[in-house]
């Protein structure tokens, strides 16, 4: 089976059943059901998802039977409009059922909530985690995909899949282990920290599928696919863009089923051709599926061919490039990109975008100017520009970073966004600057080769967890241009906002700055959270303070809190010190 | 409609060189992937070695690899294949293979649309 299946089925949910095996299958269906209805309670999707395979396994059973041949679409639709809560929890997503398919999935995705209010997920003690795991494993790993998938409606789902797997894997080990939390929380750590950093690097991939088109997504998979196999075709390379870009459709889509098993046919033909692919591949095709898929989209580079020829001379010196470029634009476009990206595995894939489209641009002018080669002869130059302004926006953010550390640069970050979007709600501002902040730790230790795709493609999924919850409550004019314009502009164009002169500075509100003896429990990312939340009310209220005057009232604060943490009457020193805190904020800073 | 015209082949004694052209004529985009492929007695068609004649990037077998060199000159619409240190199972019949470069590959003779009648290169002493 290739990636395109040309045979027919007579029932897709069979075909789908077959293929992905019944744990799969209900997985892949208690992952499609929680990522739609984002508020059900959990054993309510587990009925449905076992109605839903019980169905399954008629058609298994006989292909024929009555409503086999139905679409899943239509099958897994009508099975979310049998909930009987729909109207009272979801609202307006209640009318989706009114609507004929494809028309009712289109509603449905839609409705789906990036931000849902959902509580934080708190994790139990270990005793109290591994009695459960135990006690009924099926139902404990199910509960792990619903809560992810619910609160990530967008998330991978085969990658879920593997999520999962390792998630089981660290229970079963940790919970026969001498010491379990010592064995099992850091594992719990970095799935958290993985899964949220997967999530977010899918979120884009939909983003620039449903919001800039097919043909976005694959510009960005061709440059990506081109860095990380140079050696390959520029033929290899489009198939299996074609194929990704298949697989990222579905599962963007909520066609999770065909998304799964379209995803395990790309892993074989990759490995089956990893001669004509990657010399990196080998450890990866070694492995069962699920790790096989996830390390072959997380493998290194490939060393670049040696000897590449000059890209001028039949880009830019040729007489033949308007005439190459007419005969068959975007297989041209799509030369030039495959040819620069395999060369510069050290440019971020926004960097080789914008030099393409620059290129475009260029073409698109000089080829219907009197003197086409004229024209075009300097189109090399105009790369120049855009090449220095990342590398030393990196160079300039990671000195800083090397200077402050996370916490202080982050915070730094925090100012800085905060007075280019102050709309934004705190929240917001609080969770995107501290993870642009991440991008020192992440990509900074990096040699020059390396730091600028790690830095400028993470801040491109940064900032689009910025755009996606700003879509959901418009409150910045500056924010929605940032974020429509252009998907390969938008750091730029977000590090191109200066100061917003126009924002009225919030009212003072002293409860803002109120604190309590709880903060003294909080662990340290918490207590950070609760300190950057009041630097960016801070900011709100005097938009216009200075580095140094924010600086001193944040070190009065650390101090107060380190002191009150100290106190035997934590309470009252709260109460009797935050308020001699706030009136002396207030003076620093004019309020 | 692309025409492409093989020369070059002949006997050569092992460790001796030959080299191969091939002229196409007709639309230059469907012939900017250009390859060379080889068929010997009772054997599959193999690729040999592939150039795309805008970006000018070379691909070859592993078994070829250091011994052969493709190259092109488009001013002529002409590819060829430089082949040194010739072995024994270098002997067959060589085919100058042409196509859309989102398509060939070259591990994959059915990509290629446009093909030459062929040129024997016979490797012995």
């Known amino acids: 089976r290739g990636v395109f299946r040309r045979d027919a089925h007579k029932s897709e949910v069979a075909h789908r059943f077959k293929d992905l095996g019944e744990e799969n299958f209900k997985a892949l269906v208690l992952i499609a059901f929680a990522q739609y209805l984002q508020q059900c309670p959990f054993e309510d999707h587990v009925k449905l998802v076992n109605e839903v395979t019980e169905f399954a396994k008629t058609c298994v059973a006989d292909e024929s039977a009555e409503n086999c041949d139905k679409s899943l679409h239509t099958l897994f639709g009508d099975k979310l409009c049998t909930v009987a809560t729909l109207r009272e929890t979801y609202g307006e997503m209640a009318d989706c059922c009114a609507k004929q398919e494809p028309e009712r999935n289109e509603c449905f995705l839609q409705h789906k909530d990036d931000n849902p209010n959902l509580p934080r997920l708190v994790r139990p003690e270990v005793d109290v985690m591994c009695t459960a795991f135990h006690d009924n494993e099926e139902t404990f790993l199910k509960k792990y995909l619903y809560e992810i998938a619910r609160r990530h409606p967008y998330f991978y789902a085969p990658e879920l899949l593997f999520f999962a797997k390792r998630y089981k894997a660290a229970f079963t080990e940790c919970c026969q282990a001498a010491d379990k939390a010592a064995c099992l929380l850091p594992k719990l750590d970095e799935l958290r920290d993985e899964g949220k950093a997967s999530s977010a690097k899918q979120r884009l991939k939909c983003a620039s599928l449903q919001k800039f088109g097919e043909r976005a997504f694959k510009a960005w998979a061709v440059a990506r696919l081109s860095q990380r196999f140079p050696k390959a075709e520029f033929a290899e390379v489009s198939k299996l863009v074609t194929d990704l870009t298949k697989v990222h459709t579905e599962c963007c889509h909520g066609d999770l089923l065909e998304c799964a098993d379209d995803r395990a046919d790309l892993a074989k033909y990759i490995c089956e051709n990893q001669d004509s692919i990657s010399s990196k591949l080998k450890e990866c095709c070694e492995k069962p599926l699920l790790e096989k898929s996830h390390c072959i989209a997380e493998v290194e580079n490939d060393e670049m061919p040696a000897d590449l020829p000059s890209l001028a001379a039949d880009f830019v010196e040729s007489k033949d490039v308007c005439k190459n470029y007419a005969e068959a634009k975007d297989v041209f476009l799509g030369m030039f990109l495959y040819e620069y990206a395999r060369r510069h595995p050290d440019y971020s894939v926004v960097l080789l975008l914008r030099l393409a489209k620059t290129y475009e641009t260029t073409l698109e002018k000089c080829c219907a100017a009197a003197d086409p080669h004229e024209c075009y002869a300097k189109v090399f130059d105009e790369f120049k520009p855009l090449v220095e302004e990342p590398q030393n926006l990196i160079k300039q953010n990671c000195e800083l970073f090397e200077q402050l550390g996370e916490y202080k640069f982050q915070n730094a970050l925090l100012v800085r966004y905060t007075k280019k979007v102050p709309q934004v709600s705190t929240p917001t501002l609080v969770e995107v600057s501290r993870n642009l902040g991440k991008v020192g730790s992440k990509c900074c230790k990096h040699p020059e080769a390396k730091r600028m795709p790690c830095a400028e493609d993470y801040l491109s999924v940064v900032l689009n967890q910025l755009c996606v919850l700003h879509e959901k409550t418009p409150v910045s004019d500056r924010v929605t241009k940032c974020c429509t314009e252009s998907l390969v502009n938008r750091r730029p164009c977000f590090s191109a906002l200066e100061v917003d002169e126009t924002y009225v500075p919030k009212e003072f509100n002293a409860e803002t700055f109120t604190f309590h003896a709880d903060i003294c429990t909080l662990s340290e990312k918490e207590r950070q959270i609760k300190k950057q939340t009041a630097l960016v009310e801070l900011v709100k209220h005097k938009p216009k303070a200075t580095k140094e005057q924010l600086k001193a009232v944040m070190d009065d604060f650390a101090a107060f809190v380190e002191k009150c943490c100290k106190a035997d009457d934590k309470e009252t020193c709260f109460a009797e010190e935050g308020k001699k805190l706030v009136a002396a904020s207030q003076a620093a800073l004019g309020l | 409609e692309v025409q492409l015209l093989e020369s070059g082949g002949g006997l050569v004694q092992p460790g001796g060189s030959l080299r191969l052209s091939c002229a196409a004529s007709?639309?230059?985009?469907?012939?900017?992937?250009m390859g060379w492929f080889r068929q010997a007695p009772g054997k599959e068609r193999e690729g040999v070695s592939s150039?795309?004649?805008?970006?000018?990037?070379?691909f070859y077998t592993n078994s070829v690899k250091g011994r052969f060199t493709i190259s092109r000159d488009n001013s002529k619409n002409t590819v060829y294949l430089q082949m040194n240190s010739l072995r024994a199972e270098d002997t067959a019949v060589y085919y100058c293979?042409?196509?859309?470069?989102?398509?060939?590959?070259?591990?994959?003779?059915?990509?290629?649309?446009?093909w030459g009648q062929g040129t024997l290169v016979t490797v012995s002493s």
């Open positions: 007709g639309n230059t985009y469907l012939t900017s992937c």
């Open positions: 293979a042409a196509g859309s470069p989102a398509r060939c590959r070259l591990r994959d003779p059915t990509t290629f649309d446009y």
């Open positions: 150039i795309y004649t805008v970006g000018g990037s070379t």
